[in-house]
C-alpha cells in the first residue's frame, strides 16, 4: 500500500486508568498531514466519537480507561501529499495494584517510572502525564510507600514534586495521582515511580556528563552511512544505563524490523577518578525521515541529542 513502516515499542500501561498516545513523528507530522489510528491491522479506523471508550482525538489515541483486553499492536497512519508512514505501537496492559496488593506486581519499569534524587541537594520528581487538550487534569497528589506525602520539605509545583535537602530516607516507591476529566466524566490516573538516591561523587557530581553530542546538528548526505559516538564521563561505581533512543524508544527497538539504525557495543576507558564511556549509533543508510529527528544519547538522568540535517546546497 506504499506506506513506510516504522516500529516502536511502548509497554508500561496500567489497566483501569486513562492512557493516551500521540502519533508524532517529526518532521513528518510538522506539515500538512492526516493521521488515522487503527487496531491490530484492522481496516476500520478507531472511532472519533468522543463518547467511545477508545477514540481518536486529533493525533492522539485515547483510552478512557485502558482495559485488560486492550493489549495489542496499534497503527497510526500519517498521510502527507507525497508520503505515507505507518507507525506500529505495541501496547501491553498490566494490572497495577501496588498499594492494594503485591500480587501481579509491576513489570519492569520504564525510565519515566524510575527517577533519581541527589543526596543533600534540592531536587524534584516528575509526574509524566501525556494527554490531549480535551483532558483536564486536576491537582496532583503525591504518595510515598502508599501514604500521602506531607511536610515542609515537599512542594508540589505543576507536574513536579520538589524535594528540598534530599536524604537517604527519600528513596522508595512513590506515586502521583491526578483526577482527569473528559466530557464531564472523571477518571483516576496513578503513576508509580521508583526512586533511588545518588550521592555526589568526587570528580564533580555523580550525574553522568555527556561530552558529545551537545544537542547539535550534523550535516549528512542522503543515503550515506553515518556513525556517531556518544562520549560520557561517569563515576567508577555507577550503575547508569547508557543508550541511544529516538521518540523515547531504544533505537534497536524502534528500527527492530529494518535494523537500518543500530546501537553499537559500549566501550569504556578507566581514569583515576572516573570512567569514559563510548556508545555509538550507526545509520547504515541515512533516509529522508531521519532529518530533523532528535536522536538522544541517554546516560542515567543525562541526555543529549544529535539532529541530522541536509547539507546546504552548494551554489558555487
Amino acid at each position: 500500500d506504499g506506506c513506510n513502516d516504522i516500529f516502536m515499542k511502548n509497554e508500561m500501561l496500567s489497566a483501569s486508568q486513562p492512557f493516551a498516545f500521540n502519533c508524532t513523528f517529526p518532521p513528518i507530522t510538522s506539515g500538512e498531514v492526516s493521521v488515522t489510528w487503527y487496531k491490530n491491522s484492522s481496516k476500520i479506523p478507531v472511532s472519533k466519537i468522543i463518547q467511545s471508550r477508545i477514540h481518536q482525538d486529533e493525533t492522539w489515541i485515547l483510552f478512557l480507561p485502558m482495559e485488560w483486553g486492550d493489549s495489542g499492536v496499534y497503527q497510526c497512519v500519517i498521510k502527507g501529499r507525497d508520503s505515507c508512514h505507518r507507525i506500529h505501537v505495541n501496547l501491553t496492559v498490566f494490572e497495577k495494584q501496588w498499594c492494594d496488593t503485591s500480587v501481579k506486581g509491576l513489570p519492569n519499569l520504564s525510565d519515566e517510572y524510575k527517577q533519581i534524587l541527589h543526596l543533600g541537594k534540592d531536587d524534584s520528581l516528575t509526574c509524566h502525564l501525556h494527554f490531549p487538550k480535551s483532558c483536564i487534569l486536576g491537582p496532583i497528589k503525591w504518595y510515598k510507600d502508599c501514604n500521602e506525602i506531607t511536610g515542609e520539605r515537599f512542594t508540589v509545583l505543576e507536574t513536579r514534586l520538589l524535594v528540598s535537602n534530599v536524604s537517604a530516607e527519600d528513596r522508595g516507591n512513590y506515586a502521583c495521582q491526578v483526577i482527569l476529566t473528559h466530557s464531564g466524566k472523571q477518571y483516576e490516573v496513578l503513576n508509580g515511580i521508583t526512586v533511588s538516591i545518588t550521592e555526589r561523587a568526587g570528580y564533580g557530581g555523580s550525574v553522568p556528563k555527556i561530552i558529545y553530542p551537545k544537542n547539535n546538528s550534523i550535516e549528512v548526505q542522503l543515503g550515506t552511512t553515518l556513525i556517531v559516538d556518544c562520549n560520557i564521563t561517569d563515576t567508577k561505581d555507577n550503575t547508569n544505563l547508557r543508550c541511544w533512543r529516538v521518540n523515547n524508544t531504544l533505537v534497536d527497538d524502534y528500527y527492530n524490523e529494518s535494523k537500518r539504525i543500530r546501537e553499537g557495543v559500549e566501550t569504556h576507558a578507566s581514569f583515576r577518578e572516573y570512567n569514559l564511556y563510548t556508545v555509538n549509533i550507526t545509520f547504515l543508510e541515512v533516509k529522508m525521515e531521519d532529518y530533523g529527528l532528535p536522536f538522544m544519547c541517554h546516560a542515567g538522568v543525562s541526555a543529549a541529542y544529535i539532529m541530522l540535517q541536509l547539507p546546504a546546497p552548494d551554489f558555487r
Epitope: C99, D100, S102, V103, P107
Partner: antibody
Framework: QVQLVQSGAEVKKPGASVKVSCKAS????????MHWAKQAPGQGLEWIGE????????NYNQKFQGRVTMTRDTSISTAYMELSRLRSDDTAVYYC????????????WGQGTLVTVSS | QIVLTQSPGTLSLSPGERATLSCRAS???????LHWYQQKPGQAPRLWIY???SRATGIPDRFSGSGSGTDFTLTISRLEPEDFATYYC?????????FGQGTKLEIK
C-alpha cells in the same frame, strides 16, 4: 545486606493462638510487602497472606481468613503473623518473605519458625 | 485459584545427568509471574529462577527455565551434587498465590 530474622520455635495447645515475628534489616522496611507462608512437615508451601508495613493494608488467603491477623511495628521494623484457634494441622514451619516493588517474587526469606500444636 | 502441578514428584538421577522438571498450571500464567525456588532439608526456600527464565543472583548457568501459558520447565543441563534438593514452582499472577507440590531431585 537484607535479613529477615524470625522468632523461635513455639509449642501450643489446640485452641490457643501463636504470634510469630519477623524482624527486617538491610532495607527500608516500610517500602516492601511482607508475605507469610506455611510448610507442614514433609509438605509443600502454602501462601497465608501479605501486609504492607507502611499502610498496614493486608490481604489474606481465604483458607486462613478469620484465623490470621498480620500486623507490624514500624519502629522496630518487625512484622507479625498471629494464628488463632490452633489445630493439630497448623503444626508447620512458618516463613516470612519479602517482595520488592516491581519484582513480584520472593527474593528474601526468613529462616522459618516451627510451631507445634499438640495437646 | 491457579493450581500448579509439578511432575515428577521424585526424580532419581546421577550427577552429570540432565534433569527436566515440569510445572503445569490449571489456567494461563504470564511468564513474568512464574518462578522457581530451591529448598534443602531444614532450610528456607531460595529464589532460583524468576519470571520463567531469569536466573537469580549466583545461580549457575547450568540451570535454565522456559515455558509459557500453562506449561513451564526447569532444566539442569548437568547435575552437580549440590543440585539435589526439592524445587517448587510458584505463580504470582492471581490471589491466592500458589506453589506446586514440589519435585524432589534425589541421587540415584
Amino acid at each position: 545486606q537484607v535479613q529477615l530474622v524470625q522468632s523461635g520455635a513455639e509449642v501450643k495447645k489446640p485452641g490457643a493462638s501463636v504470634k510469630v515475628s519477623c524482624k527486617a534489616s538491610g532495607y527500608t522496611f516500610t517500602s516492601s510487602w511482607m508475605h507469610w507462608a506455611k510448610q507442614a512437615p514433609g509438605q509443600g508451601l502454602e501462601w497465608i497472606g501479605e501486609i504492607h508495613p507502611n499502610s498496614a493494608k493486608t490481604n489474606y488467603n481465604q483458607k486462613f481468613q478469620g484465623r490470621v491477623t498480620m500486623t507490624r511495628d514500624t519502629s522496630i521494623s518487625t512484622a507479625y503473623m498471629e494464628l488463632s484457634r490452633l489445630r493439630s494441622d497448623d503444626t508447620a514451619v512458618y516463613y516470612c518473605a519479602r517482595v520488592d516493588y516491581g519484582k513480584p517474587w520472593f527474593a528474601y526469606w526468613g529462616q522459618g519458625t516451627l510451631v507445634t500444636v499438640s495437646s | 485459584q491457579i493450581v500448579l502441578t509439578q511432575s515428577p514428584g521424585t526424580l532419581s538421577l546421577s550427577p552429570g545427568e540432565r534433569a527436566t522438571l515440569s510445572c503445569r498450571a490449571s489456567s494461563s500464567v504470564s511468564s513474568s509471574y512464574l518462578h522457581w525456588y530451591q529448598q534443602k532439608p531444614g532450610q528456607a526456600p531460595r529464589l532460583w529462577i524468576y519470571s520463567t527464565s531469569s536466573r537469580a543472583t549466583g545461580i549457575p548457568d547450568r540451570f535454565s527455565g522456559s515455558g509459557s501459558g500453562t506449561d513451564f520447565t526447569l532444566t539442569i543441563s548437568r547435575l552437580e551434587p549440590e543440585d539435589f534438593a526439592t524445587y517448587y514452582c510458584q505463580q504470582f499472577q492471581s490471589s491466592p498465590l500458589t506453589f506446586g507440590q514440589g519435585t524432589k531431585l534425589e541421587i540415584k
